[in-house]
C-alpha cells in the first residue's frame, strides 16, 4: 500500500540530507536568518526523509522522476524516485539525471553538439516503432534548457516548457513532446480528476494562461460527470 511505501525506512535511492548552504552576508540576496519554515524542520535527515507521492514527473524534484517503487508494481502507487546516473538503465528521459537523457534504454550524457540531433532521432525512431510504449508516465526530462540555443516555436520538438518560446508550453504529441500554445480564456482545457491520468494523454493540452484556471463551464454543471466540459476561466 502507499502508506507502507511512505513509512518504510528501507527505501533505495534516498537523496542526500536536505538543506544547503546559507546565503552570503553582504550579497544582494541572502538567506533570511532565523526563519522557521512552517510545517517542518529547516533541515531534514535521511532518517525522517519521506518519499513524495506523485502522479507525474513534474510533481517531483529536478533530480527525481515519478514511478512505482517496485518493479511491475501497482501503477496507482507512485512516488518520486532519485534520478539515474550515466550508464544506468532507463525507459524515458525523465529517469536520467540532469545533463543526461535516455537513449536506447541507457542514460547517456547530453553532449551539447549532438544533443538536438540525438533527441530528434530518438523521437523519429519511436514514431516508426511498433514496440514503442506509451508507458503511462509524463515525458518531462531534467535536461537543461541551456542545451537549446533558441527557444522553440510552435511545433518544435521540446523536452520541457522552458525550451519553448513565451506563450508556448511543452506538451505530449503522440510519443514525443512539442511546443504548443498556452490556452486562452474560453478554450477547452483538461482537468485531471484521477491521479496519474496525465500519462494517458497522447495529445496533451497546455495549461491555462496566466490569470486563468481550468474550471467546469457554467452551462455544463448539470451534465454527467464524464461529459463535463472544462474551459479556461478568469480567477
Amino acid at each position: 500500500t502507499l502508506n507502507s511505501v511512505l513509512n518504510s525506512n528501507a527505501i533505495k535511492n534516498l537523496p542526500p540530507p536536505l538543506g544547503g548552504a546559507a546565503g552570503h552576508p553582504g550579497s544582494a540576496v541572502s538567506a533570511a536568518p532565523g526563519i522557521l519554515y512552517p510545517g517542518g524542520n529547516k533541515y531534514q535527515t535521511i532518517d525522517n526523509y519521506q518519499p513524495y507521492p506523485c502522479a507525474e514527473d513534474e510533481e517531483c524534484g529536478t533530480d527525481e522522476y515519478c514511478a512505482s517503487p517496485t518493479r511491475g508494481g501497482d501503477a496507482g502507487v507512485q512516488i518520486c524516485l532519485a534520478c539515474r546516473k550515466r550508464r544506468k538503465r532507463c525507459m524515458r528521459h525523465a529517469m536520467c539525471c540532469p545533463g543526461n537523457y535516455c537513449k536506447n534504454g541507457i542514460c547517456v550524457s547530453s553532449d551539447q553538439n549532438h544533443f538536438r540531433g540525438e533527441i530528434e532521432e530518438t523521437i523519429t525512431e519511436s514514431f516508426g516503432n511498433d514496440h514503442s510504449t506509451l508507458d503511462g508516465y509524463s515525458r518531462r526530462t531534467t535536461l537543461s534548457s541551456k542545451m537549446y540555443h533558441t527557444k522553440g516555436q510552435e511545433g518544435s520538438v521540446c523536452l520541457r516548457s522552458s525550451d519553448c518560446a513565451s506563450g508556448l508550453c511543452c506538451a505530449r504529441h503522440f510519443w514525443s513532446k512539442i511546443c504548443k500554445p498556452v490556452l486562452k480564456e474560453g478554450q477547452v482545457c483538461t482537468k485531471h480528476r484521477r491521479k496519474g491520468s496525465h500519462g494517458l494523454e497522447i495529445f496533451q493540452r497546455c495549461y491555462c494562461g496566466e490569470g486563468l484556471s481550468c474550471r467546469i463551464q457554467k452551462d455544463h454543471h448539470q451534465a454527467s460527470n464524464s461529459s463535463r466540459l472544462h474551459t479556461c476561466q478568469r480567477h
Epitope: 544547503g20 526563519i35 519554515y37 506523485c54 510533481e59 524534484g61 527525481e64 516548457s161
Partner: nanobody, 125 residues
Framework: KVQLVESGGGLVQAGGSLRLSCTAS????????VGWFRQAPGKERDFVTA????????AYADSVKGRFTISRDNAKNTAYLQMNSLKPEDTAVYYC??????????????????WGQGTQVTVSS
Amino acid sequence: KVQLVESGGGLVQAGGSLRLSCTASGSAFSSTVVGWFRQAPGKERDFVTAINWSGARTAYADSVKGRFTISRDNAKNTAYLQMNSLKPEDTAVYYCAAGRDRYARDLTEYEYLWWGQGTQVTVSS
C-alpha cells in the same frame, strides 16, 4: 546563484487587486522552488504561497486560499503572485524566495536559500 527582485507592490483599497512579480537573474531559476512570504510590522515573516520548479504543484496559507494565485514563467525567469480581494490584514512587506528543488517534499518545508529585498503592499480600508 539566483538573485531575486520583487516588483508590483503599492497602495490599494480593500477589495482591490495587485500583481507582484519576482524576477530572477541566473540560469538556475527553472530548477528552483519559489515561495512568497510576508512580514507585517512587528510580526514574524509568514509563508504565503509556493510553487515547484515546473508549476505542477502549489501550496497556499489558509489565510490567502481562493484569493491569491501563484504562477511562474520559466522562459521569462519570473514568478507571479496575483492578489485579489485584498484585505487590510494583507498589508505587509512581501518577499520572494527561491530554493533548490532537487527532491520533492511539502512545499512549506523547503529551505529557501535566496531572498529578494521585498516590496511593500498596503491595503487601505
